[in-house]
Interface confidence: medium
C-alpha cells in the first residue's frame, strides 16, 4: 500500500512568497514623481517579481514630531488622495498583490512613537487599523517598536483588531534590535505576528555564524512562522558586500518563512554607488536616466532595464528564486534540516512528504571549497541521495539540470547551489 500523504498545513497568502517594501514612494519612482497613481503603473513590475505583498509607506499625514498634526486616517497630499489609494488597491488585487500599509506614526520625526504621548498615539493607531481594514488593506506594518512603550501589549491588541476583522489580514512589526531574547519577548505574546529585525545583519558573513544564527532562531521560535530579512527597512547592500548578495537571496528565499525585501534588493541597489543619495532610501534605478545627477555614474548593468535583459543578472536570479519559492511544496511549507558540510559552508534540506526535495549549499568564504556533506546529521526522513540535479547556481558556468555527485561537490568562492532530488520511499 502507498504511504498516506501528509496533511497540508493551512497556508496564508504571506506564506506563499516574498514581501516587497516600498518605504519611500518618491525614491522608488524617481524623476520627482513618487505618488500613488505612479505606483499603480509599476504593479506589472512587481508581478514580474512574483512577490505576494507590497509593504507601502508610511504615506499618512505627519508633521515632524507634532502628534496633533499626525493623522493616520489621511493620506499626505504629496502622495495622492484616498481615491488614488483605492484605485491602487483595486489594481493590486487584480494582479493578486496584497497591500500592507505602514502606520508608523511619526515617520518624519525623531521618535517614531512620540514616546511621551503613548495613550494618544495608541488610540490613533486603533482607529487607523479599523479605518484602513474597512478600506480594504491586507495588513499593517509598524516599525521601530523598540521605541514603543509596552510594545508587546500594544501589538497583541492591534493583532486582535487585525485578526478579528479577518484571519487573512497580517500585522508586521519591525525592530532595530538584533538581540534574540528581545525578539523572542516581542513574539511570545503575539502568536501570528511577523517580526522583521536586524537579527541576521550580525551574521558576520561566515557560513558557521549564519548557520548558528538561523538554527538558533528556528529552534527558539518553534513551529511559528518566521520572516527573513536583514533589517526592518534597509537595503541588503547596507549590510552585505556585493559578492554575497546572490548567496543571501538564495538563502532568504529557501529558509522556512516569508522573505522580506526592500525595493532595489532585486538589482543590488547600493546608495554608496550613488553620490548624494540617502543610505536608507536611494533612488530606484529603472534605467540609466534614473540618476541624472552625475553623468555616467549609472551603467546599464545596475538598472532594472539592463538586468532584465541579462539572464545571468541578480534580477533574473531573484525572479527565478521567487518563482520556485511560490510553487514548490517543499519550499512553501517543507521541513528544514541544517547539517554540516565543512568550514565556511551552510547547508540544509527542505522537504515535504513525497514531494520533490531541495538541497541548499552556501559557500560564504572567498575560497573554493569541497563540501563534505555530513548526511549522518540528518534524520531518516530527510536522507541525502548519492546525486541531485542542479536547479541553479548563484554563479554562471554550471550546466543546469545536470546531476551532481554529492560526495564530490565543489563550490566556487561565494557560490550557492540549489539542488533538487526526488522523494525515495
Amino acid at each position: 500500500r502507498a504511504p498516506r500523504c501528509r496533511e497540508l498545513p493551512a497556508q496564508k497568502w504571506w506564506h506563499t512568497g516574498a514581501l516587497y517594501r516600498i518605504g519611500d514612494l518618491q525614491a522608488f519612482q524617481g524623476h520627482g514623481a513618487g505618488n500613488l497613481a505612479g505606483l499603480k503603473g509599476r504593479l506589472d513590475y512587481l508581478s514580474s517579481l512574483k512577490v505576494k505583498g507590497l509593504v507601502l509607506g508610511p504615506i499618512h499625514k505627519n508633521q515632524k514630531d507634532d502628534v496633533a498634526q499626525t493623522d493616520l486616517l489621511q493620506i499626505d497630499p504629496n502622495f495622492g488622495s484616498k481615491e488614488d489609494f483605492d484605485s491602487l488597491l483595486q489594481s493590486a488585487k487584480k494582479k493578486s498583490i496584497r497591500v500592507i500599509l505602514d502606520l508608523t506614526p511619526n515617520y518624519r520625526g525623531e521618535n517614531s512613537w512620540f514616546s511621551t504621548q503613548v495613550d494618544t498615539v495608541a488610540t490613533k493607531v486603533k482607529d487607523a487599523l479599523e479605518f484602513w481594514l474597512q478600506a480594504g488593506v491586507d495588513g499593517f506594518q509598524v516599525r521601530d517598536i523598540e521605541n514603543l512603550k509596552d510594545a508587546s501589549s500594544f501589538l497583541a491588541e492591534w493583532q486582535n483588531i487585525t485578526k478579528g476583522f479577518s484571519e487573512d489580514r497580517l500585522l508586521i512589526a519591525g525592530t532595530n534590535s538584533s538581540d534574540l531574547q528581545q525578539i523572542l519577548s516581542l513574539l511570545e505574546s503575539n502568536k501570528d505576528l511577523l517580526l522583521t529585525s536586524s537579527y541576521l545583519s550580525d551574521s558576520g558573513s561566515t557560513g558557521e555564524h549564519t548557520k548558528s544564527l538561523v538554527t538558533q532562531y528556528l529552534n527558539a521560535t518553534g513551529n511559528r512562522w518566521c520572516s527573513w530579512s536583514l533589517s526592518q527597512a534597509r537595503l541588503l547592500t547596507s549590510f552585505l558586500p556585493a559578492q554575497l548578495l546572490r548567496l543571501y537571496q538564495l538563502m532568504l528565499f529557501t529558509l522556512p518563512g516569508t522573505p522580506v525585501f526592500s525595493y532595489g534588493d532585486e538589482i543590488g541597489l547600493d546608495a554608496a554607488a550613488l553620490p548624494g543619495q540617502p543610505m536608507e532610501a536611494p533612488v530606484m534605478l529603472w534605467d540609466e536616466s534614473s540618476f541624472p545627477d552625475i553623468p555616467g555614474a549609472v551603467s546599464a548593468n545596475m538598472t532594472v532595464k539592463g538586468q532584465s535583459e541579462d539572464p545571468g543578472s541578480l534580477l533574473s536570479l531573484f525572479r527565478r528564486l521567487s518563482d520556485q519559492r511560490s510553487k514548490e511544496r517543499s519550499l512553501l511549507h517543507g521541513d528544514f534540516h541544517a547539517f554540516s558540510a565543512g568550514p565556511g559552508l551552510f547547508s540544509y534540506i527542505r522537504h515535504w512528504d513525497q514531494n520533490e526535495r531541495f538541497l541548499v549549499v552556501l559557500n560564504f568564504g572567498d575560497v573554493g571549497l569541497s563540501a563534505g556533506l555530513q548526511a549522518s546529521d540528518l534524520p531518516a526522513s530527510a536522507s541525502l541521495p548519492a546525486k541531485a540535479d542542479l536547479l541553479l547556481s548563484t554563479q554562471p558556468g554550471r550546466e543546469e539540470g545536470s546531476p551532481l555527485e554529492l560526495e564530490r561537490l565543489k563550490l566556487e568562492p561565494h557560490e550557492g547551489l540549489l539542488l533538487r532530488f526526488p522523494y525515495a520511499a
Epitope: 488610540t123 512603550k149 497583541a156 519577548s185
Partner: antibody, heavy 114, light 107 residues
Framework: QVQLKESGPGLVAPSQSLSITCTVS????????VHWVRQPPGKGLEWLGV???????NYNSALMSRLSISKDNSKSQVFLKMNSLQTDDTAMYYC????????TSYAMDFWSQG | DIQMTQSPASLSASVGETVTITCRAS??????LTWYQQKQGKSPQLLVY???TLADGVPSRFSGSGSGTQYSLKINSLQPEDFGSYYC?????????FGGGTKLEIK
Amino acid sequence: QVQLKESGPGLVAPSQSLSITCTVSGFSLTTYGVHWVRQPPGKGLEWLGVMWTNGITNYNSALMSRLSISKDNSKSQVFLKMNSLQTDDTAMYYCARGGHYGSTSYAMDFWSQG
Amino acid sequence: DIQMTQSPASLSASVGETVTITCRASGNIHNYLTWYQQKQGKSPQLLVYTAKTLADGVPSRFSGSGSGTQYSLKINSLQPEDFGSYYCQHFWNTPYTFGGGTKLEIK
C-alpha cells in the same frame, strides 16, 4: 474608596497549585489594570504579571510556564493561579492597581495587604 | 529583559540629613521609573512615578530625577517616618522588574 483584598490558602503543599483571588472595589477592572507582585520573607519585590483592562495579560518570563492570570469584570475579581509550587515560592503575594497600558502615568498606586 | 540595579543596598542616616538612592537600568527606560516605600510588615506605597512626579500626599522633601538609564530618589531633611525600605521599578516593557531595594535605617 479604592481597595484590593486577597483571598486564598495560607499554605500549599509542594508540587501543588496556588490560587489567589483579588477582589477590588472603588474602581472598575475595565478602567484599570491589576498587577501581581510577590515578596519572599526578608527579600525584595518580584513582579509576576499583569491583567490589562482589555483582557490581555503579560507575565514574568521566568515564571510564564507556571503562571496564569484571569479576571471576571462583573465580579470585580482578578485570579492568580500558579502551578508546581516549591518552597522557594514561599512569599507574601500582593495584587496592586495599575494604569491602563496606554496611560503615561504608570505606577501601582494602591496595593492589597498581601 | 531590563535589569534594575539599586544602590546602596543599605544606608544609615540621622533625622534631618539628606540621602540619595540610585537606580540603574540595563537599557533606556525613557523615564518610566517608579519609586515605592515599604515599612516593616506593610504593603509598599507609591512615592514617585515617571521618574519625577510625586504621588498624591507625598511630602515635598521627596524628589525623583534622572533619565535614560540612571535615576535617583532624594530625601531632604529625613523624618522618623521615612525609615524603611525603598524600591525602584521600571515600567518600560514587560517584565516590569524591581530594583533589589535599599534599606534606610536610623543611625
